[in-house]
Interface confidence: low
């Protein structure tokens, strides 16, 4: 197909465009056409600009001519000058490039002349009659800035189609002037439109960042997502990050908030900063810097040991006075030689008995000054209804010192597919002080219910960790905390947490933590029934140190912040020392994360193209007063360039037609 019968085409650089219009026009018509589009007839003043014109025009047919913006009035010959007396339609004669086809003629230049460029060969300049209609014309458009052509995306149905401010539609652009529109058609049938706009930080750029064809799904470029790409129902995609990572500001890449090791001991993704720091058992966050950990002096906690306590970094030990020996719980003391089982078996009674050493509850709060405490003890929870309760404890016997944990049936807990969790905390980070009361089990303040919130990103239903919830009245029963009843056998029913060994208090939730899929529990457990708990009491989950001596506080109210489970040893070690180091696996208090309905990550809104319209006010290089091509005036004195800013003011046609009729020479290209 003859390219000259085709559509106009353009070549753009960062500051200007040349456009070729293959339309038969006179010089005046061509000039008007360029002005109406906001440009001018082409003024290739430099070799670089000439190269761009060359590349645009290409190798056209041999006889074809294109008007450019050079015009000379009658009798204005200046043959010694580079432009030979011709003036650019922008009003000046500045040039660093000429490409005349013929040497200058020495004639008197009686008629107005205009310059056309040969479409073939070396694109030489020919002068000729301005009234002659040639095969086309070249326009030039200047502008403040340009946007680079869009990179093709794999999801595109074809190349981007650009519409310039001068109404040229093409796919073949390297640069797009300010005000251009890019239309991208996607294979999914949808499309995207972008505008080349001024950017707030200066310069120009596209109104929207890619990828544009998200509707084509997640391939072949994973939707631009670093981790997971999810195809939504409406055809667009959203990016998600694997657990332990968060979506970056670009909505596509993922970042690991703990990668920079912001915490001294343990880091967990989540929280307002993107991560939260936790301290191991026996440590608490430093008051001046929550990223650091300082040793907790557990011995300052009333009743932590029945008799004597020695604190050390990361833990503590209980001791007994002469004639007494430490019981298996590591806390209580009994007369040397006496069997310790009785004291422990009487725990239920002691919990509910009135103690002799009463301590004002407010004083206890003040004394502990809000410090974090990782204490063994009893975790009180606010109930939604009065629970039954059974203590998961079996008396110790010399031949078998190991308390056992109930063995779940093969179908319980249900199997989970375990995602990799890069950071998990094995701490119970207590953010409220221990409440000590010798007279009754202390209930949490109504204003401060002890909830255990999940601070890590919500998991899918398949990957959720069970709940020890304080206030979840609306949760379906499957997600409510299970309470062990006095009348239940040792085999726990589905959806209830198994009993917890008081000596090895690792918590085995009803839905086993996906972080540790290989954990195994063996053995059976008998229960020691406690006396009935009054209906206003909260459900009790026993953990380490549940066998409290008579002088011990009734309960420890814990408010936790760390929510993930510690690594649970498959084979539980025997306790061979009286050491009460909370760091030892046998003395870790483990709290499962709250099970919450899976919350989908916030989806990125599908960006619609910017709806603003940008007024196009191209600035032209060498923008002296725009010149209107004039045809021959009545006398040389009047054949001057008259600046006129109004592009609509058409030049007057003065008798050139008559001249042309009488002068064969004027109609020929020299």
């Amino acid at each position: 197909q003859d390219p000259w019968a085709a559509e106009p085409r353009a070549a753009c650089g960062p500051s200007s465009c040349y456009a070729l219009f293959p339309r038969r026009r006179t010089f005046l018509e061509a000039w008007r056409a360029c002005r109406e589009l906001g440009g001018d007839l082409a003024t290739p003043r430099t070799p670089e600009e000439a190269q761009r014109v060359d590349s645009l025009v290409g190798a056209g047919p041999a006889s074809r001519l294109l008007w450019i913006g050079l015009q000379r009035q009658a009798r204005q010959c200046q043959l010694q000058r580079p432009l030979r007396g011709f003036t650019w339609t922008t009003g000046d004669q500045d040039t660093a490039f000429t490409n005349w086809a013929q040497p200058a003629s020495g004639g008197p230049c009686p008629a107005q002349r205009c310059v056309a460029l040969e479409a073939s060969g070396e694109h030489r300049w020919l002068e000729g009659s301005c009234t002659l209609a040639v095969d086309g014309y070249l326009c030039q458009f200047g502008f403040e800035g340009a946007c680079p052509a869009l990179q093709d995306e794999a999801g595109q149905a074809g190349p981007a189609v650009y519409t310039t401010p001068f109404h040229l539609v093409s796919t073949e652009f390297e640069w797009l002037p300010f005000g251009s529109v890019a239309a991208v058609q996607c294979q999914a049938g949808r499309g995207a439109s972008l505008l080349c706009v001024k950017q707030p930080e200066g310069g120009v750029g596209w109104s929207r960042a890619g990828p544009l064809c998200l509707g084509t799904g997640c391939s072949p470029d994973n939707g631009g997502c670093e981790h997971e790409c999810v195809e939504e129902v409406d055809g667009h995609v959203s990016c998600r990050c694997t657990e332990g990572f968060r979506l970056a500001a670009d909505g596509r890449s993922c970042e690991d908030p703990c990668a920079q090791a912001p915490c001294e001991q343990q880091c967990e993704p989540g929280g307002p900063q993107g991560y939260s720091c936790h301290c191991r058992l026996g440590f608490r966050p430093a008051e001046d810097d929550p990223h650091r950990c300082v040793d907790t002096d557990e011995c300052q906690i009333a009743g932590v040991c029945q008799q004597m306590c020695v604190n050390y970094v990361g833990g503590f030990e209980c001791y007994c006075s002469e004639g007494h020996e430490l019981e298996a719980d590591g806390i209580s003391c009994s007369p040397a030689g006496a069997m310790g089982a009785q004291a422990s078996q009487d725990l239920g009674d002691e919990l509910l008995d009135d103690g002799e050493d009463e301590e004002d509850e407010d004083e206890a709060w003040k004394a502990f000054n809000g410090g974090w405490t990782e204490m063994p003890g009893i975790l009180w929870m606010e109930p939604t209804q009065p629970p039954d309760f059974a203590l998961a404890y079996r008396p110790s016997f010399p031949e078998d010192r190991e308390p056992q944990i109930p063995y779940p049936e093969p179908t319980w807990p249900p199997p989970l597919s375990a995602p990799r969790v890069p950071y998990h905390s094995s701490v119970l980070s207590v953010t409220r002080p221990v409440v000590v009361s010798a007279t009754h089990p202390t209930l949490p303040s109504a204003h401060q219910p002890p909830v255990i919130p999940a601070t890590h990103p919500a998991l899918s239903r398949d990957h959720q960790i069970p709940v020890i919830a304080a206030n979840y009245p609306d949760l379906p029963s499957a997600y409510q905390p299970g309470i062990l009843s006095v009348s239940h056998s040792a085999q726990p029913p589905a959806h209830q947490p198994p009993m917890i060994s008081t000596k090895y208090p690792e918590l085995f939730p009803a839905h086993q933590s996906p972080m540790f899929p290989d954990t195994r529990v063996a053995g059976t457990q008998t229960t020691t029934h406690l006396p009935g708990i009054p209906p206003n009491h909260a459900p009790l989950v026993t953990t380490l140190g549940a066998q409290l001596p008579p002088q011990a506080p009734d309960a420890l109210v814990l408010r936790t912040q760390a929510t993930q489970l510690p690594i649970i040893p498959t084979a539980q070690p025997s306790l061979t020392t009286t050491s009460r180091s909370p760091v030892s696996p046998a003395h870790q208090i483990s709290v499962p994360a709250a099970t919450q309905p899976a919350a989908l990550p916030t989806l990125l809104p599908s960006q619609s193209p910017t709806n603003q319209t940008s007024p196009i006010s191209p600035t032209h290089p060498h923008s002296k007063a725009p010149q209107i091509p004039r045809e021959d005036g009545p006398s040389p004195k009047l054949a001057l360039w008259l600046p006129s800013p109004a592009p609509t003011a058409a030049p007057t046609a003065l008798g050139e037609a008559g001249l042309a009729e009488h002068s064969q020479r004027d109609d020929r290209w020299l």
């Epitope: 995306e153 794999a154 391939s219 072949p220 994973n222 790409c229 999810v230």
Partner: antibody, heavy 116, light 107 residues
């Protein structure tokens, strides 16, 4: 564990047809683009075709367009490549791959020999 | 089509050396460039995705960099187990294309 197992290869005469299957397990098949990549003996890897998650969008290399058809059965978690009008230059080991853009899981490959 | 040119075709190194494999694209592929390792008689294995992101389970000895049209795969402290062919692949535009591969040998 993600597994892709190809089947259906063998010896076939030029101009004849053959259908390859790829059974997928260990991931949610419907959520992923899938692709076929081939490797001629002692040669490099060559992408053949890809299919969108629903099987509605399909993409082919020019040399197989009109002759090969990629399809998927979401219910069966199976990917197919129907190869018609086979040519000797189609001789290769054909791999089924999960296409996240990059190919993150590959099958063990199935050999297709086109020869008279 | 985007053509990916890999060099060298074959690379012979001694264990413990660090090597660089090059992949050059005929057009810009942005960051949509990936690297695969293929051992003899095995399926390819994804090493690096999106220019420099290591796939899970890949030793940290493997790293990659580059942008636009020039990309490099680096292998530190080469081991006998690294003897393989290494291919780059682009997912910038259809058709998806692979480089012709670089074969790594141990002296």
């Amino acid at each position: 564990e993600v597994q892709l197992v190809e089947s259906g290869g063998g010896l076939v005469q030029p101009g004849r047809s053959m259908k390859l299957s790829c059974s997928a397990s260990g991931f949610i098949f419907r959520n992923y683009y899938m692709a076929w990549v081939r490797q001629a003996p002692t040669k490099g890897l060559e992408w053949v075709a890809s299919t969108g998650t629903g099987g509605d969008f399909t993409y082919y290399r020019d040399s197989v367009k009109g002759r090969f058809t990629i399809s998927r059965d979401t219910a069966e978690s199976t990917l197919y490549l129907q190869m018609d009008s086979l040519k000797s230059e189609d001789t290769a080991t054909y791999y089924c791959a999960r296409a996240y853009g990059y190919f993150d899981y590959w099958g063990q490959g199935v050999k297709v020999t086109v020869s008279s | 089509d985007i053509v990916l040119t890999q060099s060298p075709t074959t690379l012979s190194v001694t264990p413990g050396e660090t090597v660089s494999l090059s992949c050059r694209a005929s057009h810009s592929v942005g960051t949509n460039l990936h690297w695969y390792q293929q051992k003899t008689n095995e399926s390819p294995r994804l090493l690096i995705k999106y220019v420099s992101q290591s796939n899970s389970g890949i030793p940290s000895r493997f790293s990659a960099s580059g942008s636009g049209t020039d990309f490099t795969l680096n292998i530190k402290d080469v081991e006998f187990d690294d003897v393989s062919s290494y291919f780059c692949q682009q997912t910038q535009s259809w058709p998806l294309t692979f480089g012709s591969g670089t074969k790594l040998e141990i002296k």
